[in-house]
Amino acid sequence: APVPPGEDSKDVAAPHRQPLTSSERIDKQIRYILDGISALRKETCNKSNMCESSKEALAENNLNLPKMAEKDGCFQSGFNEETCLVKIITGLLEFEVYLEYLQNRFESSEEQARAVQMSTKVLIQFLQKKAKNLDAITTPDPTTNASLLTKLQAQNQWLQDMTTHLILRSFKEFLQSSLRALRQM
């Protein structure tokens, strides 16, 4: 698994560098997760032809993966720091069940999948410290998540491979949008 942010050789070699700000730490955490996603996607794409599949739109419609929309206040037009932050945290919390699903989906990158999951939990904690309005953040219902996980794991092999591909791709897109929005805060 990759070294967690703040512990890479670059940081060790540059002790004179100013400590990271809260925003920079969050930025670095997201990049670390994105690197992990890239490694997982490499294995997924090498193992199956899902990355080129034209049937992904059909499968995507059956998954309720978090997405950024204009109303979420994360885009330049209508940017709203608090609304956007709530959306990012809520979205990450919703992704957690899908990251749990990924845990048994990798052979050579099992550690990497765990690192992505744990790093996302850390990112959520960072962001919750930043949020002023924690009451607006809705936590997914554990019972609903458990039944969703069971349903996903009961799919046939082709659908499981497709689901894995779509989760990784959607999570990457969500993090990219989040990263851009968070820089403006």
């Epitope: 920079e24 994105l34 997405k67 204009e70 791709r169 897109e173 990219q176 851009r180 820089r183 403006q184």
Partner: antibody, heavy 116, light 107 residues
């Protein structure tokens, strides 16, 4: 090797609409943000706006009322339209790719001249 | 909008010289700054991102530093192919903005 190829009309009259298209070859369209940037002759760079595959856009407020950036995911292309052009819009227009940081890949540029 | 101001606007230097270009942001941008090189009639080329990370394939004589509002691009030993115009650009917020450019000419 990812390449951006751009094309469009090079000579326009005042009040016409500038229209340029940029095609992405050899890389993923979905995972990046795609921008238009312009450079008037002998001057610096000005960011016009960007689009994501989903169609979400961000525009430079100074041009927003005249700019439309759209996407055609089936063709791996995105386009720029700039309405009511004047001589001040004469520039080299570039398309470029942005992931998390810089504009790492650029099109070859298209010189657009506005003259009556 | 965040204003980016480069200095100097132009400079003359010889092959082998150490060259430093500075860029100042009108407000703090953390380390969300990129540097580009542009040669006549060509598209800009990315050199550095995140203030100090070298883009792949860029020679190690190029380096970047800074955080907050003040940034520097250094060319440790100027080569003939380095004579060009250099731009800084912030990507903390929208709209993305560039410095006005620094032209590096042969002395």
């Amino acid at each position: 090797q990812v390449q951006l190829q751009q094309w469009g009309a090079g000579l326009l009259k005042p009040s016409e609409t500038l229209s340029l298209t940029c095609a992405i070859y050899g890389g993923s369209f979905r995972e990046y943000y795609w921008s238009w940037i312009r450079q008037p002759p002998g001057k610096g760079l000005e960011w016009i706006g960007e689009i994501f595959h989903s169609g979400s856009t961000n525009y430079n407020p100074s041009l927003k009322s005249r700019v439309t950036i759209s996407v055609d995911t089936s063709k791996n292309q995105f386009s720029l339209k700039l309405s009511s052009v004047t001589a001040a819009d004469t520039a080299v227009y570039y398309c470029a790719r942005e992931e998390l940081d810089d504009f790492d890949i650029w099109g070859q540029g298209t010189m657009v001249t506005v003259s009556s | 909008d965040i204003q980016m101001t480069q200095s100097p606007s132009s400079l003359s230097a010889s092959v082998g010289d150490r060259v430093t270009i500075t860029c100042r942001a009108s407000q703090g941008i953390s380390s969300w700054l990129a540097w580009y090189q542009q040669k006549p009639e060509k598209a800009p080329k990315s050199l550095i991102y995140a203030a100090s990370s070298l883009q792949s394939g860029v020679p190690s004589r190029f380096s970047g530093s800074g955080s907050g509002t003040d940034f520097t691009l250094t060319i440790s030993s100027l080569q003939p192919e380095d004579f060009a115009t250099y731009y800084c650009q912030q990507y903390k917020s929208y709209p993305r903005t560039f410095g006005q450019g620094t032209k590096v000419e042969i002395k």
